[in-house]
């Protein structure tokens, strides 16, 4: 058993049919020394007598808040949630497995840049009696700060008559180096409770590989005299990292029919222009990522070439 | 929310078999877990099994164990109550009721509860 917050304590129950539980001892936080009674959530069944009541927490239903009181007046509570293992394996039934990049993936991160700043996000079909808190470090031995906010509710989808709802926050290293090598990763720990349940998920990385640069901003098209070629033109967005002759990206122009079938052209440039056909009905695109190492393209830039 | 309609229920001999079902529609991936209660007139609501929707995972009352079998079929949304060696004394309304919590045998952790069907048991 360990404290999770003031007077919320968590039980580590490794369960299995016939599990015999463990055991828990919870003291009344008073001076008093007699006349004290123990009850259970709005139960009003005197559990036990005394400063201290031993448990035996084999099930959900031996969690929740316990109570002493005496003459009835409320000296403390106590809520016991339950941290549940079946099989050696911690329980994961808060979040949805977003199984991208891989199966088990529950947290998702990504950074715009190379400031030391990233978002991360889950997914839930829960709606209600959930809390979240998110905390992080760069290296778990002799961890050096980051400072996460509030986990906020970010988006609601229905897929089909599921409910899918999307958490995320906001986390920002206290002393970011964006030109220095990372050689420890960034760790991400979110506690999640739902009801009486307490689970745990981590996620750890380097900021270099969850690198999402924002698409390139000011796409234009300049047509070129006396031909079907067009000059395209954009520019590093705004989010990312400077200067940008250190902090370069290279970009892919995707010349794209109106039907899907149609084949795509794609030029690769690490210049902010590039010439290319522009046929009727087609739109042109453009994406960018780093130059020097291969993390995740950012979305589209597009614009009709008419 | 989950929606639950338990049947199955009847008149049997003690030392007799009876299966319950309870179909489930609606947003049944919100809740882990589906358990079987029963109430005997002027009793409150007591525990007998549950089951995982998922992994199969079982969790019996003491008065349960060896004579009930709670199983589930996913593909028809449907949990089983296999009673067998019925006694006068399992002659109750019997409910189930979808929960986050699984194990937990408190009602209070239960919802989305079916309209029960009736098991009487005659000697």
């Known amino acids: 058993i360990w404290e999770l917050k003031k007077d919320v304590y968590v039980v580590e129950l490794d369960w299995y049919p016939d599990a015999p539980g463990e055991m828990v001892v919870l003291t009344c936080d008073t001076p008093e020394e007699d006349g004290i009674t123990w009850t259970l959530d709005q139960s009003s069944e005197v559990l036990g007598s005394g400063k201290t009541l031993t448990i035996q927490v084999k099930e959900f239903g031996d969690a929740g808040q316990y109570t002493c009181h005496k003459g009835g007046e409320v000296l403390s509570h106590s809520l016991l949630l339950l941290h549940k293992k079946e099989d050696g394996i911690w329980s994961t039934d808060i979040l949805k497995d977003q199984k991208e990049p891989k199966n088990k993936t529950f947290l998702r991160c990504e950074a715009k840049n190379y400031s030391g700043r990233f978002t991360c996000w889950w997914l839930t079909t829960i709606s209600t009696d959930l809390t979240f808190s998110v905390k992080s470090s760069r290296g778990s031995s002799d961890p050096q700060g980051v400072t996460c906010g509030a986990a906020t509710l970010s988006a609601e989808r229905v897929r089909g008559d599921n409910k899918e709802y999307e958490y995320s926050v906001e986390c920002q290293e206290d002393s970011a180096c964006p030109a220095a090598e990372e050689s420890l990763p960034i760790e991400v720990m979110v506690d999640a409770v739902h009801k009486l349940k307490y689970e745990n998920y981590t996620s750890s990385f380097f900021i270099r590989d969850i690198i999402k640069p924002d698409p390139p901003k000011n796409l234009q098209l300049k047509p070129l005299k006396n031909s079907r070629q067009v000059e395209v033109s954009w520019e590093y967005p705004d989010t990312w990292s400077t200067p940008h002759s250190y902090f370069s990206l290279t970009f892919c122009v995707q010349v794209q029919g109106k039907s899907k079938r149609e084949k795509k052209d794609r030029v690769f440039t690490d210049k902010t222009s590039a010439t290319v056909i522009c046929r009727k009905n087609a739109s042109i695109s453009v994406r960018a990522q780093d130059r020097y190492y291969s993390s995740s393209w950012s979305e589209w830039a597009s614009v009709p070439c008419s | 929310e989950v929606q639950l309609v338990e049947s199955g229920g009847g008149l049997v001999q003690a030392g007799g078999s009876l299966r319950l079902s309870c179909a489930a529609s609606?947003?049944?991936?919100?809740?882990?877990?589906v358990g079987w209660f029963r109430q005997a007139p002027g009793l409150e609501r007591v525990f007998v099994a549950a089951i995982r929707w998922s992994g199969g995972s079982a969790y019996y009352a003491d008065s349960a164990k060896g004579r009930f079998t709670i199983s589930r079929d996913n593909a028809k949304n449907t949990v089983y109550l296999q009673m067998n060696s019925l006694k006068p004394e399992d002659t109750a309304v019997y409910y189930c009721?979808?929960?986050?919590?699984?194990?937990?045998?408190?009602?209070?952790?239960?919802?989305?509860w079916g309209q029960g069907t009736q098991v009487t048991v005659s000697s």
């Open positions: 609606g947003r049944t991936f919100s809740s882990d877990a």
């Open positions: 009721g979808a929960t986050s919590l699984f194990p937990s045998s408190r009602g209070s952790h239960y919802d989305s």
